[in-house]
Every structure is written in C-alpha cells, then in structure tokens.
Interface confidence: medium
Amino acid sequence: EEELQIIQPDKSVSVAAGESAILHCTITSLFPVGPIQWFRGAGPARVLIYNQRQGPFPRVTTVSETTKRENMDFSISISNITPADAGTYYCIKFRKGSPDTEFKSGAGTELSVRAKPS
C-alpha cells in the first residue's frame, strides 16, 4: 500500500481580521485507519483546532465531507479570524487505538493576520 503523505501545499496564508481562512490539507492514503486533527503550534503547548471525531468547533468547518469513508481532503475553514489566530497550523494523522497515537504530520501552514481594512 502507498505510504501516507500529508500534503499542506501552502507555506503561509495571510488573511484580514474578520475574514475566513482556508487551510488546505489532503492525504494520499486511507491507511492507517484513524482520525485527522488540526493543531496550532507544535510541542506540548499546541492548541487543538479541529478533531474529526470530536466537536463541536464553532468557528471551524471542513471544506469537504469528511465523514465519507473515501474522503482524502481535510482542508478546514476558520471563520472570523482575529490576531490571536496567528500561528503555524499542522494537519496531523492519528492511528486508531486506545488512545489514538500521532502517526504523521504535515509540514505546517503559517497563518498571518492583517489589520481589518478600514
């Protein structure tokens, strides 16, 4: 089976405050089985932004229908961006288990927030 790749094609995305940010992420294989999660930042201080299995995440919507079994697009849209949302976002595949374990991470997309146009 093909080795899983997590593709985050945008190195950075710049969005005006108040707008929505789309963060792209696709995977190249359905294996191993397990959820996708999005985090802002890396390491112990990282913040969970979206979890395919949990919720709700009021400001986050998925671009594709992630509940479909064959879905490989895990891009998300974050609404009403504020300066506090700035940071690097990682799309991470987890392997199913008790608990789920981190399997592979995308390269990250840096979100910068511009001042709201007057």
Epitope: Q5, I7, P9, D10, K11, S12, H24, T28, A107
Partner: antibody
Framework: DVQLVESGGGVVRPGESLRLSCAAS????????MNWVRQAPGEGLEWVSL????????YYADSVKGRFTISRDNSKNTLYLQMNSLRAEDTAVYYC????????????WGLGTLVTVSS | ETVLTQSPGTLSLSPGERATLNCRAS??????LAWYQERPGQAPRLLIY???TRATGIPDRFSGSGSGTEFTLTISSLESDDFAVYYC??????????FGGGTKVEIK
Amino acid sequence: DVQLVESGGGVVRPGESLRLSCAASGFTFSSYDMNWVRQAPGEGLEWVSLISGSGEIIYYADSVKGRFTISRDNSKNTLYLQMNSLRAEDTAVYYCAKENNRYRFFDDWGLGTLVTVSS
Amino acid sequence: ETVLTQSPGTLSLSPGERATLNCRASQSVYSYLAWYQERPGQAPRLLIYGASTRATGIPDRFSGSGSGTEFTLTISSLESDDFAVYYCQQYYDRPPLTFGGGTKVEIK
C-alpha cells in the same frame, strides 16, 4: 536584484564525486527555501533536492537519494550540493533555484553549471 | 507522484500567431501550477503561478487558465523572444515537485 551563481561543475568519471555551490545575493538568503533542479542534454527539467531556510527540512528525488547531499551556509549565503557515486545519467546542467516564500514554485534561477559524467 | 503531461511536444508557428500550450496532471493539483520559459543559454523564467497569475514583469500577452487537472498557457500574439521551450510545474503534491516534459515553440 536577486542573483544566483552556480559553480563547481566539470567532467568526472563514473563513481567519482563533485561539489556544487550556489552563491546568492540580493535577498535575505536564510528566509528562503532553496532547491537544485537539473536538465539532462535534450531533456526536460527535473527537480533534485530541496532545503528549508533553516536547513532543518530536506527532501531528495528518488533518483539521487543516498548519493547526493544538499546543505547551506546561511552565514556565507551559499547553497551546496555534494554529489557522490556519480553516474552517466547524472550528466546535466544543474540549476540553483529560489523558492517563492509562500508556495513551492521557483521565482529566481541561476544560469546553471554543467556536470558531465563520462568514462 | 503527480505526473504532468504537456502537449503538443512542438508547436510550429509564425510571429503574430496565437500559441496554445496544454498541461495535464495525473491527479488534481487545484490551482497550484506554474509555467516557465526557457531560452537557450538562459536561466528558466517564471511566467505564471497559481495557474493564472502573471509573475512580475511578464507581458500581458501571456495568460494561464485551468484548474484541477487541465491547464493552458496562451501566448496571444507571438513575438520573436517567445520562441522557446515552456514547462509546467505542479507544487501541490510534494515532494517531489514535478515538471512537464516541455513544449517547444519554434518558428514556422
């Protein structure tokens, strides 16, 4: 103006080594990911290797993995490609290419340096 | 790995004519596609990125279109400097970054 100047090409025998350099100027070198792209005689462009601005992230094409090593010295604004165990099929013009800061396309290229591997 | 197929391999046209170059991706690359021009003895030059955005300093006779798997580079009226080899490159699926095989635009 951005300038990328490759050097170090030449004629070598199969199995030998060569080190290419790319001297960069006109931009903040350490802020940009850099790549090597090659073009064999009469052929198209082939991506060879990528190194992130900090040097922490590195990728290689399968055709050179285990034989070529990309590196950079940000204090000297220089990109390198160490090529070992050279083969005839490595004969090409090697270009140094600067990535755009948002996406992985190449907005600046050097003129290239020719590497010929022949017995 | 995403394979890019360019067609035709060679395009023979006269100055002033319109050139249409095609690039097909083996899987969707959305709009993450760039076009380059390569003249003999010169460094490749970025023409188009994001499938349709002209790079700085590129004349408006060059235009790009398409998304997903089908892309087109159009040169509305060929000038002498435009006779060269053109490559498409995808930067969605990486690594490896992949290029098409090239289309040579030659004088008829």
